[in-house]
Amino acid sequence: SPLLLFANRRDVRLVDAGGVKLESTIVVSGLEDAAAVDFQFSKGAVYWTDVSEEAIKQTYLNQTGAAVQNVVISGLVSPDGLACDWVGKKLYWTDSETNRIEVANLNGTSRKVLFWQDLDQPRAIALDPAHGYMYWTDWGETPRIERAGMDGSTRKIIVDSDIYWPNGLTIDLEEQKLYWADAKLSFIHRANLDGSFRQKVVEGSLTHPFALTLSGDTLYWTDWQTRSIHACNKRTGGKRKEILSALYSPMDIQVLSQERQPFFHTRCEEDNGGCSHLCLLSPSEPFYTCACPTGVQLQDNGRTCKAGA
């Protein structure tokens, strides 16, 4: 049965969704406002954002007394969303106050702003590394879901109707479907990854969904108002059940499993794709792009960053 990893503002926790006695285990405690969370399964690493400390932090699972390390501690204001590219070994995040979407290495180095225009309240972010695409929600004045290449290319709005507060976002990697939860319109919908063939999954019976994840045939989501984690069938919305209740303040949630992070080979593995700094996955050939930290230019060879990086 799936292990659910979730942020709970003051801590990050784990719960076995199929356990007989549903009790959560604390992964890391003593936090201010843990909001977004993700992981790198192969290394047992857990990453989270803290919107009060204005930081992205990291620790390791299954390591007694594992230290908490700072990954990014400057230039953040409200990092609402976080996603780990387990293939390209990068972190992507949204910041609803700086109105940016950024990427960096897993240790926070070679940080690059991918998007800084036409963002209002960017929140959830999800990755499909196999196809080189990233997806994010924006619950601002013009609410929408967008997608772009993980290298910042080919940005496109894919959902902008019947949408108000799109909070949760997750990808069904096997079936190539996008799921999202709308906290204002009280639904969970799904669609193809280009936004087409939209379908209702759950409607009208949600209070304030915040984050959404998936395992097998089951969707899991957190709800601010009920302070709980819920589940249902990903196709029908049936088999609704409450997984865990009476939480402090459940925020982002992920299914902690190898299945959620299937491995495959990319050009970025071989000598970093020949890139001096960032090797970012891309949806178009050669399926990767060399990139430089913000403020540093790429040389004409398309691989090396100019001095100063």
């Epitope: 406002d33 919107v51 009060s52 409200s78 609402d80 609803s96 619950w139 204002k184």
Partner: nanobody, 129 residues
């Protein structure tokens, strides 16, 4: 300089009422979400209530829902906290706070004391017989 000045605190018997006021100056009041927080002796500062810029939406901690009411008068640059059916556990220093970034109940940091930009000095409320 920005100033938030709370008033209206005092000693009240259990079941009684008080109305706290917070007068703001040095900021464009109508652009700020306003919050009330409280801190009891030996405890962490906790969220009590907040009201968004227009006054159209209000939010409360579970412990005060149905008893406390937050309101604002943008023409007077003042936010109020009407406290009814007071209990001994409501005893605390009450602080007024201003946050320009608040955007209603979908905003992650509405309830977080760590992100309010400006704070008053506080007013003491004691509920005791």
């Amino acid at each position: 300089a920005v100033q938030l000045v709370e008033s209206g605190g005092g000693l009240v018997q259990p079941g009684g009422s008080l109305r706290l006021s917070c007068a703001a100056s040095g900021l464009t009041f109508s652009r700020y979400t306003m919050g009330w927080f409280r801190q009891a002796p030996g405890k962490e500062r906790e969220f009590v209530a907040a009201i968004v810029r227009s006054g159209g939406s209000t939010y409360y901690a579970d412990s005060v829902k149905g008893r406390f009411t937050i309101s604002r008068d943008n023409s007077k640059n003042t936010v109020y906290l009407q406290m009814n059916s007071l209990r001994p556990e409501d005893t605390a220093v009450y602080y007024c706070a201003a946050d320009r970034r608040g955007r209603g109940e979908n905003y992650i940091l509405l309830y977080s004391s760590g992100r309010y930009e400006y704070w008053g000095q506080g007013t003491l409320v004691t509920v005791s017989s």
